[in-house]
Interface confidence: low
Amino acid sequence: SERCDDWGLDTMRQIQVFEDEPARIKCPLFEHFLKYNYSTAHSSGLTLIWYWTRQDRDLEEPINFRLPENRISKEKDVLWFRPTLLNDTGNYTCMLRNTTYCSKVAFPLEVVQKDSCFNSPMRLPVHRLYIEQGIHNITCPNVDGYFPSSVKPSVTWYKGCTEIVNFHNVQPKGMNLSFFIPLVSNNGNYTCVVTYLENGRLFHLTRTMTVKVVGSPKDAVPPHIYSPNDRVVYEKEPGEELVIPCKVYFSFIMDSHNEIWWTIDGKKPDDVPVDITIIESVSYSSTEDETRTQILSIKKVTPEDLKRNYVCHARNAEGEAEQAAKVKQKVIPPRYTVELACGFGAT
């Protein structure tokens, strides 16, 4: 057959769906790889063909569209499962072709199981709500196209595995869940379960997301350096280990790039002829404020090292900060010893 433009396995689209639930998967060709849509392709005489490779197999095989109740079907550029089964997991390929043209792409589909509390290996989207600020709404995601607008599904919302009823500041309303003045106690996993009827069959769509209540933009500040500071002096003798923490607080700022770094005599540590180790660690508060620490250590400090200028720097979307560490050589007090000189008198 003719050469086919093979876009390979599109691992950017690692699609995960729940077992025993409907799934509709659009062929990625029209969304990400080709400049035209399915309707244009179809009206130009191109045909969309689907096939798949089962998990842990190499053999490509056609998809069986003759299963009972049309469990798997294709509609325009969408592959439908009504519902999925665990062994539908595999790599799926959609190919657009006619006698002179061919283009195809594969993508992985993983069918995952959930327990009765909606726990599963599913990667969860994260919704961030600003603490103690106004009303935030989240909407049950990825349910468009599953049922016509004439169908009014029932929607039940859960926090963890508890149905949201009479919650202090959380109120479900159909596809939406409203948070009134969000609090840290609202952190957690929220699930909407959409139940609808299609041709006499009941289907459920389960969508879980993580809600994180984060610092408000009004609380955003430039970095604050806890350490080093003016109160602490790093006084060492040559040969001792010098350890200086650069510890910085960053208030939560959406999409802010927080960074800290050391300079030694105005240079990067790598550019200074000193055997330096730097270890970085990060911790987060409940509102995702960040404390970032870089510990600078010199195993055996020399007198020259103790004369250098060590500066901790920090930067976020709100600004920059820097703070020099007070480093000095410990003054060794003189040792008073009694010297008994036995003098041999000269004549």
Partner: antibody, heavy 120, light 107 residues
Framework: EVQVVESGGGLVQPGGSLRLSCAAS????????MSWVRQAPGKGLEWVAN????????HYVDSVKGRFTISRDNAKTSLYLQMSSLRAEDTAVYYC?????FGSGYFDYWGQGTLVTVSS | DIQMTQSPSTLSASVGDRVIITCRAS??????LAWYQQKPGKAPKLLIY???NLESGVPSRFSGSGSGTEFTLTISSLQPDDFAAYYC?????????FGQGTKLEIK
Amino acid sequence: EVQVVESGGGLVQPGGSLRLSCAASGFTFRSYWMSWVRQAPGKGLEWVANIKQDGSERHYVDSVKGRFTISRDNAKTSLYLQMSSLRAEDTAVYYCAREGYFGSGYFDYWGQGTLVTVSS
Amino acid sequence: DIQMTQSPSTLSASVGDRVIITCRASQSISRGLAWYQQKPGKAPKLLIYKASNLESGVPSRFSGSGSGTEFTLTISSLQPDDFAAYYCQQYSYYSHTFGQGTKLEIK
């Protein structure tokens, strides 16, 4: 504790009417589909009807369509079954049952049942 | 409507026995199947939902399996309290149909 308690059963003549009630407590009634299931003496179980959380959808077994009406009052946490044009084959214990798992259609809590006898 | 066929209709067994009850659907119902236990004069009690999920509080000697059209309820070691009627029920489609029941009696 989840509880469902049926009432309203009794003896009725063929062609007559009867209204069954089910009082629910111990759970958020308005969040659940509810069903009626019946069992004729010495026979198996038969699902009769169910109703969506907000009452906007109702389904019936073919044998009762047009004769039975399921309804609910969420404020009173009550479920009802209005039965008319009753026949001898409607004689059964009628159970009120809560549908579990978001209205999937299996029944996780049942009442103890109320007996309806259709006889002349 | 989907027909649910249970077998056997009566089963005689002894305490300690392993018992299997089967249920067949007239067409595929995926995993939309529940099992119930009913004792004389009592309401049915849910044992298994979604073909294999054990309802909370139900002893682990009860287990369910199957998907599509063939399902089984297994009692691994019969206890005196297990002698009762058992029903399967499909809930993939309206109407929600029950099997005709299996009466489990003491041998």
